[in-house]
């Protein structure tokens, strides 16, 4: 008769392993015992637990409630014990040694492997800001046994670069993602993706990038001079920029108050109907946490029952 | 003929030291896992203490343990059990008995006792 | 320690009589049990191992039963020479240990 086992088991941290052992006897051949033992190297055997043709099974202390037979049917020459809630400490060698009438006795090793999954975590850099150089946007790591592998997942431009760090029986791994930061990868999502055998899909976490910017303001509503003139009604200027975080919006007259009657809404200047008063420079302040900009317009009023025509001067700063 | 013959006991006052030994008969004694065990006047069984066939595997009952010391020479087909710090109620009949050999090289079980010597009466008494 | 404990703790039966004695374990013993036979005077003799297996020379009169933490012992037809105490053991774990006896006399 000879043995039948595994070289190696595998399975998953908490989930129950299955150890085989099974005789392929002769006919009439019988097994007494089978006797299951740890047996990593250097350090002597630790009972595991015995099946017994007549007594059923033992279980030795160090690992009662953990080890259970199949369950039935079972054939009396299978010595395959379950070893339940597999941890990490389980990993190593072990034999099943079978005593068998006539034959005698035969043993044979595997090798038990606990993959143990890693639960990662995404760590976002410091505050991406437009204009800096090459800065992390975020880091990845993820523990496991065997070590885990970590990568990127993204429609952005940027290096990444891994370093490891070995623990006595598992691994961590920590991946980085350099970027540029520009306005265009505002909102983009950044992906840490986590392989692993002891995981059924891969593990994927995602990020969205937030990248600070503010763009040059300008003033819109001085395209057609000729509608500025006296008794003009729904006459407004709008202030354009865009930014993150979304900026707030100042109105201010560079040569004295806002006109009574002028309404600030937002972005927005507000003209009641048109006199002579509401010539002037008006300043636009745009502002947000990272910059601030400023555009300034002129705004002549024409009285029609002057010839002269109207001169407007776009002047923009920041 | 399976033949164990208990032999050592008697009188032995409170803190005294008594040395049993069973001599093992129509048997490969070095074959056999091994026990003492006891039985105080008019009541049950208590086992004592065990030796593997090698010597590798020695338990004791927790009453004994620290006090009693098991031992055996597969040379001369003997069993012993050193008593010291005797007690009265270490007062029993000492009987030495062979294991059944049907579980093999598992030292976490004891087996049953298939043959049993007629025993030696231990009394520690002033 | 794995408690065992017998029931009854004495019995009178006649000659020819149906007799069972239990045993009942604090834990599970599989079939890890023994039973024994003593007579005043002597040593105790197995009856009964691995539950349910007859000792070699034993008369098949007796019979065990049971496993995990249940067992019964049945003398199908009590015989003079069965009167005697009767003992349980446990050897799944150490210390083994033993049930405090049932006594059968005669009634």
């Known amino acids: 008769g000879e043995l039948e086992t595994s070289d190696v088991v595998t399975v998953v941290l908490g989930q129950d392993a299955k150890l085989p052992c099974f005789y392929r006897g002769d006919s009439g051949e019988q097994v007494g015992q089978v006797a299951w033992a740890r047996v990593d190297a250097g350090e002597g055997a630790q009972e595991l637990a015995l099946l017994h043709s007549k007594y059923g099974l033992h279980v030795s202390p160090a690992y009662e409630g953990r080890v259970e037979q199949p369950p039935p049917p079972r054939n009396p020459l299978d010595g395959s014990v379950l070893l339940r809630n597999a941890v990490q400490a389980d990993e190593g060698e072990y034999e099943c040694r079978v005593s068998t009438f006539p034959a005698g006795s035969f043993q044979a090793r595997l090798r038990l492997r606990v993959l143990v999954p890693p639960l990662p975590s995404l760590n976002p850099g410091p505050a991406l800001e437009e204009g800096q150089g090459l800065t992390l946007a975020a880091s990845c790591t993820a523990e496991g046994s065997p070590a885990p592998s970590v990568t990127w997942d993204t429609e952005v431009k940027g290096t990444t670069s891994s370093r490891s760090f070995k623990h006595s029986r598992s691994a961590a791994v920590t991946s980085e993602f350099h970027l540029v930061p520009s306005r265009s990868m505002n909102g983009q999502p950044l992906t840490c993706v986590v392989s692993h055998p002891g995981l059924l899909q891969d593990q994927r976490i995602t990020h969205i990038l937030h990248v600070s910017f503010l763009a040059e303001a300008s003033v819109r509503g001085l395209e057609d001079q000729n509608l500025w003139h006296i008794g003009r009604e729904g006459a407004m200027l709008k202030c354009l920029s865009e930014g993150q975080p979304p900026p707030s919006y100042n109105w201010t007259r560079l040569d004295g108050p806002l006109p009574s009657g002028v309404r600030v809404d937002g972005d927005t200047l507000g003209f009641p109907p048109l006199t002579t008063e509401h010539s002037g420079i008006y300043v636009c302040h745009v502002s947000n946490e990272f910059s601030s900009r400023d555009s300034q317009v002129t705004v002549d009023v024409l009285d029609p029952q002057e010839d002269s025509g109207k001169q407007v001067d776009l002047v923009s700063a920041s | 003929e399976v033949q164990l013959v208990e032999s050592g006991g008697g009188l032995v006052q409170p803190g005294g030291s008594l040395r049993l030994s069973c001599a093992a008969s129509g048997f490969i004694f070095s074959d056999f896992d091994m026990s003492w065990v006891r039985q105080a006047p008019g009541k049950g069984l208590e086992w004592v203490s065990g030796i593997k066939q090698s010597s590798a595997g020695i338990n004791y009952a927790d009453s004994v343990k620290g006090r009693f010391t098991i031992s055996r020479d597969n040379s001369k087909n003997t069993l012993y059990l050193q008593m010291n710090s005797l007690r009265a109620e270490d007062t029993a009949v000492y009987y030495c008995?062979?294991?059944?050999?049907?579980?093999?090289?598992?030292?976490?079980?004891?087996?049953?006792?298939?043959?049993w010597g007629q025993g030696t009466l231990v009394t520690v008494s002033s | 320690d794995i408690q065992m404990t017998q029931s009854p703790s004495s019995l009178s039966a006649s000659v020819g009589d149906r007799v069972t004695i239990t045993c009942r374990a604090s834990?599970?013993?599989?079939?890890?049990l023994a039973w024994y036979q003593q007579k005043p005077g002597k040593a105790p003799k197995l009856l009964i191992y691995?539950?349910?297996s007859l000792q070699s020379g034993v008369p098949s009169r007796f019979s065990g039963s049971g496993s995990g933490t249940d067992f019964t012992l049945t003398i199908s037809s009590l015989q003079p020479e069965d009167f005697a105490t009767y003992y349980c053991q446990q050897h799944y774990t150490t210390p083994p240990t033993f049930g405090q006896g049932t006594k059968v006399e005669i009634k």
């Open positions: 691995a539950a349910s």
């Open positions: 008995a062979r294991e059944y050999s049907d579980v093999v090289d598992y030292v976490s079980v004891r087996t049953p006792l298939d043959y």
């Open positions: 834990q599970g013993i599989s079939s890890y």
